[in-house]
Each structure stands twice: as structure tokens, then as C-alpha cells.
């Protein structure tokens, strides 16, 4: 939006469509442009002519702030933002009154007005800046410290969210966000937020509030995890019924919806958008929560964000799925479409939870601990921070605990002692407000290309050498993948988005290197789990030789900035249920394939679970669709007229350069998984 | 499912009050989210306000922030609307409805049982 008095005079543009969505953790630049038709402004024949005075401002509901003001090549930057944002073209470009601004939090978020005075002259322009995503911290159901890098980034992907990175945490730190608990991060650094340091909780900053660091720790380390959730499509939604549901029954129940359980990430969105109920409710991940986001005593303890309620007096520990409580749906376009068993049944390992230790209780330590702080020994709640200036952060506060206007929740131990869904400390908290095959097979007369990826499963080879830390997964497969509509479109968070709908993960340096050295090869850059951007190449060739030359092995072009767009390396383990070939004489559209499926209590396979299928012995020369769109068969045993001399799954697309779905009113086989 | 009756409804000057009241009959009024939706003449229902099962949790149209509130009391099955600094544009039939669904942004379809409704009148 841009102001001017009245034309030929000083006029003020942002060049940049409002509202713009950032992702928190993100720098940002906001173009600001002034044309100054005036010639310079003199106010006497003796003086010298005035320059023009820029002056930058965030507007939100509840104030103004100047950021900053600059003229004649001096910038004073308000003491609350020095480090944080700077006019990058200034005084270079004495017209160029660009913005910009590091490490965004949510309080980042407003209207930020460029304005420009002239002499009497005067103009501005604005632009409204939204500050996407929430970092969370989670743990493991069963009890703290449990998971290791790759489980870390799988819990986070199970709820909807990716780990989130050092400058994520750091930005949700400066929003207020204080966790005594050690946590992995994107970077394979462990760390944890401390506003108001005290004993157990110093780490390496002694007694200074800030972001605690272990450095760099070998990934089979355990501990918990920070993740961000970036943002929904759908919708979160409560379902309830006079008796309430067990976990099934709330499971059911969204089915019948429409909808399904939500997870841990959609409800912290939805919390940050601004849910409130006073009510627990079943999650995907048969934890149960409830989003607290107008403060009360009767209902969280008076303190705001999700809530969890536990089966243990320690906090640990998930409620009977048998107990009775409120469902917590999602219902949107965006479903992550996550297996009934995905996280387990009955195992506690890849069951996960966000959770806080109880006030003046230590929790027992998976291991020997020379250092007490390193752990965080002893957690006690905090008042909610609401506009946490750099300079002041609030002070702690103990919590007293209050039951639930209606039936308490209760253990479901031996003791007979009462649980209510409260008494974790603040977790993020702080200011809301915080088709067909190469052989000739019936099928549409359209011309398909297939793609050959060599897909190999994952083992290790002799010799090869082990990474520490990194135990090797026998059985499991490394793919590629790429959404259907072009290649390289794929950001770091939708790369690992990608790997979880298709039931895979984002894969590891190590887990593409075992698959490198056991014959893999792609001639295709995609993303792994640590921000990497690599491909395998066994026989090198022109486009291929990357930073390699000639030698055989993965490219790398190191780290990447997550905005860039690549393809994605995938990794999935084990099959837990069937994939099954189903065809008929006329086949399926993609929306008859969809149904089909569903009609013999199965859903379309996904691109993971067919590769997990193949792994297994699965080997059709018929293409099938799968879940995402995409037509894809598996080969085991290569034959000339089934897809090319190596085995694999061979993706079908629209276009000799590898891209493009096949239309979903086409007809062909379908693969289900059960 | 419950059956719905609104009351207090009339004619009452830019600025004043009215407290409209729903009482249901039927079983386990307090398992169900009750709103209230309002339709003005050749205008489509519009949402209101909805309050939790519970009680606890309250949502409000933009519209009507500040100015409206609403409460249960489940030992009397009633739900109520108390609406102050009423303003014209609030003319409207306003309906009371019940519903196993709460959300943010609720919808009729998420309501399985209506009212008959009750005239509000907001002169200038």
C-alpha cells in the first residue's frame, strides 16, 4: 500500500504484495522506494538544503513502535532492535530505504510503515509481514531423554511439524519461550531455552538467560526434541458425544467426520491461531491435550498454551486408550495421511508426546550424569510472558494446581490418585497474540515415459564404513522422489513433508551413502535429514559429475539454504501391513482407485509403502495408482520388456523430462495397501 | 437429539440490552456445544457465538466482540445471549442450536438441532 499527498509530489512504494508470510527463525528484506521530485530543500539562502528523513514503524493492535529513523546518511536504530534490523542500501543509495530484519519471532508479526518526510512534504507506505510457525518441544511417551536424531525427526514429522532449526528456537526464545529440557535440532545441535536461569538448568550460560547448547552430539544420543510446525490448510475441530470416546472410538468418530485425529503440530497451530477449550481430547497420537489460550485458574492453572494430560504423577505416561475423553479432529486439504499403526501398537518407543517434568520432582535419567544442569534436573512452571522485551524477561512463578470445572481425570494406576491436565510449564506460550509400463499393457493410448530409479534396499556392505552414532538400518530402502509436477520443487520443510506422506522419512547422509555403496545411483540432487543436498553416482557422466569429477560417489552441495528447491531422498523401513495389485477390465480413474481402496477396508498405497512392498518380492509389470497421484510399478526381476535391466519401482509420467502426474480421469491398475 | 426454545426477544433502542434465553429438553444438554446464529431479512444465517459443552470456552463473530456474551447453565439446560450496545445492523432472527462439533469458525451444518428462533428489533 502506498500514500502520496497529491501527485509530482514525494511518493513512497514497497513493491511487495501484503500480506507476506514468513516463516519464524527467517530474516527478512522489505523493499521501500521513494521518489523525491523536489530539488533540495533550503530554508534560507544561507542553509544547507534539508535531507529527506525515512522513518520505519511496526504497527499492531495494541501499539506503535518506531524501529528506526535515518537522514543524512546517519541511521538510530531504537536500543530494542539493534541487533535485529538495518537499512542494508543506506546511505548508498540515498533513495533505497529497504528494511531488513533478522531472525523473526511471531511478536515480529504487524504492519510495518516506511515513511518519508521531505520538508513539509510527507509519505508512506506499508506492507502487513505474518510470521508463520510454532516450536514445540516433545518428548517420547514413555519418559524423558528417549529418542535419538532419527527418531527426534520422525516424532516431529508424526505431528505434523519438521525439528526445528537453531534460529527457530532462538526466535522462539526471544518470544518468550523458556523449556528446562534438552532437545535435538534441525543441525544435530541439543538445546533448551532458559529465560531465568536456576540450579539444574545453567547448561553453558551460567546464570544469563539465553538459548543453552551442547554442541554437536552424536546422533544416537538421546534426548527430547524441538520441532516447528509451519501451518494448516484445515481445520481443528472437537468432537464429543454424552460417554465421551476411548482412543478408537475418537478415531472413528473423525472418520465419520470427515476428518481425522489431529496431531501434536495441528493443535499447536491451532492454539496459536487462537483455540481455546476447556476440554482434554484425543490426538493421532493417542496423547491427550487441550489448547488453553485465555488464561483462567479453573481450566490449565491459569497459564496458557497446550496442555497435556498424563497417566503418571511424573508426567510421563499416556492416558488408557480405553479412557474416555472429547476427540480432537483435523479436517482440511492438507491431511497427512498417517496408518492407523504408525505410531505402534502398544510399544511405547514411537509413541510421542510433549511434556514437562512435575515441579520438585527429578525424573530418573537414562543414563549417568556428571553435570545436573546438562539434564535440567527440575522444572517449575512460569507465568506466560507477554510482550517480552529483549532487555526484561518475567520472572518465574510457581504454579498451584487446580482441578477441572468437571470430573477430574484419573490415573489409571493403582494409587488412586487424580491427574489433571496441567502442570507442565510453558511450552511455547509466550505471546499468542504466541499407468503404463514400457511392455505393451491395456491401457489409455497416451504417451507415458517411465523413469528408471534404481532403487536398492539399504544394508551394509563389507567394509563399508560405519558411521558413529549412526547405526545402519538393515532392510529398509532409500528412494527418490518428486512430486509429480516438476523436478526441483521441493523446499527442506516440503522435501520432509513429502518423505511422511508417502509413509518414508527424510533420508540420512548415512542411509543414502549404504545405499550409494550397495549400487544405488540418481542423477538427481535431493535433500537429506541434515540440510544437505547430495545424489549417488556409481558411473559418472557429464551432468553428473557434481564435486566429484569423475570418481564414483554422492555429490554433495553441502548445506543449503531451506528455501532452495530440490528433489528428496527418501527412507522406509519396514512394511507394517500388505500392499495388494487389484485391476479389472476397465480399470480405475485415480478417484475410483481411491474408493476402491477404501471399500475393502484399505487405502491407496502410498509411494513408501510400495517401495517397502518391492523390497519384500513385490513385482508387477502393471502400473498402479497410488496415493499421491502418482502410477508406479514395482520390479523385482528385470526383464527387457518391463522396465529396463536393473529392479526397482518405475514411475510413470506425463513428459520425456520426467515430470507431470498422469490425469486423474486416465485408467489403470491400482496398488492397495492394508 | 434436544428440542429448542428461544425467548426474549423485541424491539429495543440503538444502545440497549436484551437477554435471550434457549432452553432445551431432552437428555445430556451438557454434552452438547450450544450457538447461537442470527439471520437478517435476505441474508444468509450468520454465526454468532458458540459455547463449549462445558462451558469453558466461548467464540465470538468479530461483530458482536465486546458486546455479546454468552453462558450455560447446565443444571437448568438453558443457554443464554446477553447483548448489549445493541446497533441496528444487529436486527435479526436469532436461533439457538445444538451440536456435538465446536470449533473456531463454526458452521450450521455443524449443529444437528435448531430453534424456531426469536425476533430481535434494534430501532435507531
Known amino acids: 500500500e502506498e500514500t502520496s499527498d497529491h501527485d509530482n509530489s514525494l511518493s513512497v512504494s514497497i513493491p511487495e504484495p501484503s500480506p507476506m508470510r514468513v516463516l519464524l527463525g527467517s530474516s527478512l528484506t522489505i523493499p521501500c522506494y521513494f521518489i523525491d521530485p523536489m530539488h533540495p530543500v533550503t530554508t534560507a539562502p544561507s542553509t544547507a538544503p534539508l535531507a529527506p528523513r525515512i522513518k520505519w514503524s511496526r504497527i499492531t493492535k495494541e501499539k506503535e513502535v518506531v524501529l528506526l529513523v535515518a537522514t543524512e546518511g546517519q541511521v538510530r536504530i531504537n536500543s530494542a532492535y539493534q541487533d535485529k534490523v538495518s537499512l542494508p542500501n543506506y546511505p548508498a543509495i540515498p533513495s533505497d530505504a529497504t528494511l531488513e530484519i533478522q531472525n523473526l519471532r511471531s511478536n515480529d508479526s504487524g504492519i510495518y510503515r516506511c515513511e518519508v518526510m521531505h520538508g513539509i512534504e510527507d509519505s508512506e507506505a506499508t506492507l502487513e509481514v505474518v510470521v508463520k510457525g510454532i516450536v514445540f518441544h516433545y518428548r517420547a511417551i514413555s519418559t524423558r531423554y528417549t529418542l535419538d536424531f532419527d527418531r527426534a525427526q520422525r516424532a516431529c514429522l508424526q505431528n505434523s511439524a519438521i525439528i526445528a532449526t537453531p534460529e527457530q528456537l532462538q526466535a522462539a526464545y526471544e518470544d518468550g519461550f523458556h523449556q528446562c529440557d534438552a532437545g535435538w535440532l534441525a543441525d544435530q545441535t541439543v538445546r533448551y531455552p532458559i529465560h531465568t536461569p536456576r540450579e539444574g538448568c545453567y547448561g553453558d550460560k551460567d546464570e544469563f538467560p539465553g538459548v543453552r547448547t551442547y554442541g554437536i552430539r552424536d546422533t544416537n544420543e538421546t534426548y527430547d526434541v524441538y520441532c516447528f510446525a509451519e501451518e494448516m490448510e484445515g481445520e481443528v475441530l472437537y468432537a464429543t458425544s454424552p460417554e465421551k470416546f476411548t482412543f478408537q472410538e475418537a478415531a472413528n468418530e473423525c472418520r465419520r467426520l470427515g476428518a481425522r485425529l489431529a496431531t501434536t503440530g495441528q493443535l499447536y497451530l491451532a492454539w496459536q491461531g487462537g483455540m481455546d477449550m476447556c476440554s482434554a481430547g484425543w490426538l493421532a497420537d493417542r496423547s491427550v491435550r487441550y489448547p488453553i489460550s485465555k488464561a483462567r485458574p479453573n481450566c490449565g492453572g491459569n497459564l496458557l498454551g497446550v496442555r497435556t494430560v498424563y497417566l503418571h504423577a511424573n508426567q510421563t505416561g499416556y492416558p488408557d486408550p480405553s479412557s474416555r475423553y472429547d476427540a480432537i479432529c483435523y479436517t482440511g486439504e492438507d491431511f497427512v495421511d498417517i496408518p492407523e499403526n504408525f505410531f505402534g501398537v502398544g510399544g511405547e518407543e514411537d509413541i510421542t508426546i510433549q511434556t514437562v517434568t512435575w515441579p520438585d520432582v527429578e525424573l530418573p535419567l537414562p543414563r549417568n550424569i556428571t553435570e545436573g544442569e546438562a539434564r535440567g534436573n527440575v522444572i517449575l512452571t512460569v507465568k506466560p510472558i507477554f510482550d517480552l522485551s529483549p532487555t526484561a524477561p518475567e520472572p518465574e512463578e510457581p504454579f498451584t494446581f487446580v482441578p477441572e470445572p468437571e470430573k477430574p481425570f484419573t490415573f489409571a494406576t493403582d494409587v488412586g490418585v487424580t491427574a489433571f491436565p496441567e502442570a507442565e510449564n510453558r511450552t511455547g506460550e509466550a505471546t499468542r497474540p504466541w499407468g503404463v509400463p514400457e511392455e505393451s499393457t491395456p491401457g489409455p493410448a497416451f504417451t507415458a515415459f517411465t523413469s528408471e530409479d534404481h532403487v536398492v534396499q539399504v544394508t551394509a556392505v563389507p567394509g563399508a564404513a560405519e558411521v558413529p552414532g549412526q547405526p545402519r538400518l538393515p532392510g529398509g530402502v532409500v528412494f527418490h522422489y518428486r512430486p509429480g509436477s516438476a523436478r526441483y520443487s521441493l523446499t527442506f520443510e516440503e522435501a520432509q513433508q513429502a518423505c511422511l506422506r508417502t509413509g518414508a522419512v527424510i533420508a540420512s547422509p548415512e542411509q543414502l551413502q549404504a545405499a550409494y555403496e550397495a549400487g544405488y545411483e540418481q542423477c538427481d540432487a535431493g535433500w537429506l535429514q541434515d540440510q544437505t543436498v547430495r545424489y549417488p553416482i556409481v558411473s559418472p557422466r557429464t551432468p553428473c559429475v557434481g564435486d566429484k569429477d569423475s570418481s564414483p560417489g554422492v555429490r554433495t552441495y553441502g548445506v543449503r539454504p531451506p528455501s532452495e528447491t530440490y528433489d528428496v531422498y527418501c527412507y522406509v523401513d519396514k512394511l507394517e501391513g500388505e500392499v495388494f495389485f487389484i485391476t479389472r477390465l476397465e480399470q480405475f480413474t485415480f478417484q475410483e482407485a481411491l474408493a476402491f481402496c477404501e471399500s475393502h477396508n484399505a487405502t491407496l498405497a502410498s509411494t513408501g509403502q510400495l517401495y517397502a512392498a518391492w523390497r519384500q518380492g513385490l513385482d508387477k509389470c502393471y502400473a498402479g495408482w497410488l496415493s499421491d497421484g502418482s502410477l508406479r510399478y514395482p520390479i523385482v526381476t528385470p526383464r527387457p520388456s518391463c522396465g529396463g535391466d536393473k529392479p526397482g519401482v518405475r514411475t510413470v509420467y506425463l513428459y520425456p523430462n520426467q515430470t507431470g502426474l498422469p490425469d486423474p480421469l486416465s485408467r489403470h491398475h491400482v496398488f492397495c495397501f492394508r | 437429539e434436544v428440542q429448542l426454545v428461544e425467548s426474549g426477544g423485541g424491539l429495543v433502542q440503538a444502545g440497549g440490552s436484551l437477554r435471550l434465553s434457549c432452553a432445551a429438553s431432552g437428555r445430556s444438554f451438557s454434552s452438547y456445544a450450544m450457538g447461537w446464529f442470527r439471520q437478517a431479512p435476505g441474508k444468509e444465517r450468520e454465526f454468532v457465538s458458540i459455547i463449549s459443552w462445558s462451558g469453558g470456552s466461548t467464540v465470538y463473530a468479530d461483530s458482536v466482540k465486546g458486546r455479546f456474551t454468552i453462558s450455560r447453565d447446565n443444571a437448568k439446560n438453558t443457554v443464554y445471549l446477553q447483548m448489549n450496545s445493541l446497533k441496528p445492523e444487529d436486527t435479526a432472527i436469532y436461533y439457538c442450536?445444538?451440536?456435538?462439533?465446536?470449533?473456531?469458525?463454526?458452521?450450521?451444518?455443524?449443529?444437528?438441532?435448531w430453534g424456531q428462533g426469536t425476533q430481535v428489533t434494534v430501532s435507531s
Open positions: 442450536a445444538a451440536g456435538r462439533l465446536y470449533r473456531a469458525t463454526p458452521r450450521p451444518a455443524d449443529f444437528g438441532s
